[in-house]
Interface confidence: medium
């Protein structure tokens, strides 16, 4: 769910969570891509 | 069929507290971020309190920040707003709110048909 | 604070003909690439409807006359031919800055 990063904003905290969420996938796709050239 | 139905509202005299709750039905409550709107007689809409997921974080503007607070229970799927040091300006209608599951701060995706809070002597 | 100027406070407009409501934010409510302004519609008695996030984009379940652009400081709403179930109070709010702003409201009715 969305707990995880303090801010004392809360459009900042979705923000930086948007963020988290952006670069999990990122990274996600690039290790299924590592794992699918092996 | 997403649900949200709020209770507590009343008369309460200026100085005095009052507790509203928010029952959530129809989604995965724990995994949506939450938020109290409110709407003076006759005038527009102002956020009033907004809470994270798990309940670990909370915002408010400055208008009823260290008076209001926001909390939730999501093993009962209910969200409260307990309101002290009320003032003849907390008069409103009070609405919670469900935050939408995008990555879009603020907008609010789904709402309850209120409940009425007077402040008067 | 960021203030939201709506404009016109009250339109009147003949059933399907188009509506337009204008947004001014006194700051921008861009980061990022997004823009973070929403749009709600409130008829009487009822509580606020989510039509518009980030600025363009159409909740699900919302009739496609309805449609949202901009970016910065100035947005708009527009509905493209009025119908009779579209009388309500139209509400901008940004949620680039803490604390969420709402804009004064603008009244559309059928002339």
């Known amino acids: 769910h969305s707990d995880g990063i303090f801010t004392d904003s809360y459009s900042r905290y979705r923000k930086q969570m948007a963020v988290k969420k952006y670069l999990a996938a990122v990274l996600g796709k690039r290790y299924k891509q590592r794992v699918k050239n092996k | 069929e997403v649900q949200l139905v709020e209770s507590g509202g009343g008369l309460v005299q200026p100085g005095g507290s009052l507790r509203l709750s928010c029952a959530a039905s129809?989604?995965?409550?724990?995994?949506?971020?939450m938020s109290w709107v409110r709407q003076a007689p006759g005038k527009g809409l102002e956020w009033v309190a907004t809470?994270?997921?798990?309940?670990?974080?909370?915002w408010y503007p400055d208008s009823v920040k260290g008076r209001f607070t926001i909390s939730r229970d999501n093993a009962k799927n209910s969200l409260y707003l307990q309101m002290n040091s009320l003032r003849a300006e907390d008069t409103a209608v009070y609405y919670c709110a469900r935050l939408t599951g995008y990555d879009q701060a603020g907008a609010m995706d789904y709402w309850g048909q209120g409940t009425t809070v007077t402040v008067s002597s | 604070d960021i203030v939201l100027t709506q404009s016109p406070d009250s339109l009147a407009v003949s059933l399907g003909e188009r509506a337009t409501i204008n947004c001014k934010a006194s700051?921008?409510?861009?980061?990022?690439?997004?823009?973070?302004m929403t749009w709600y519609q409130q008829k009487p008695g009822q509580p606020p409807k989510l039509l518009i996030y980030?600025?363009?984009h159409l909740d699900s379940g919302i009739p496609d006359r309805f449609s949202g652009s901009g970016s910065g400081t100035d947005f708009t709403l527009t509905i493209s031919s009025l119908q009779a179930e579209d009388v309500a109070v139209y509400y901008c709010q940004q949620s680039n800055e803490d604390p969420w702003t709402f804009g004064g409201g603008t009244k559309v009715e059928i002339k």
């Open positions: 980030a600025a363009s």
């Open positions: 129809g989604f995965a409550f724990n995994n949506y971020d």
């Open positions: 809470i994270t997921g798990g309940g670990s974080y909370t």
């Open positions: 700051q921008s409510v861009d980061y990022d690439g997004d823009s973070y």
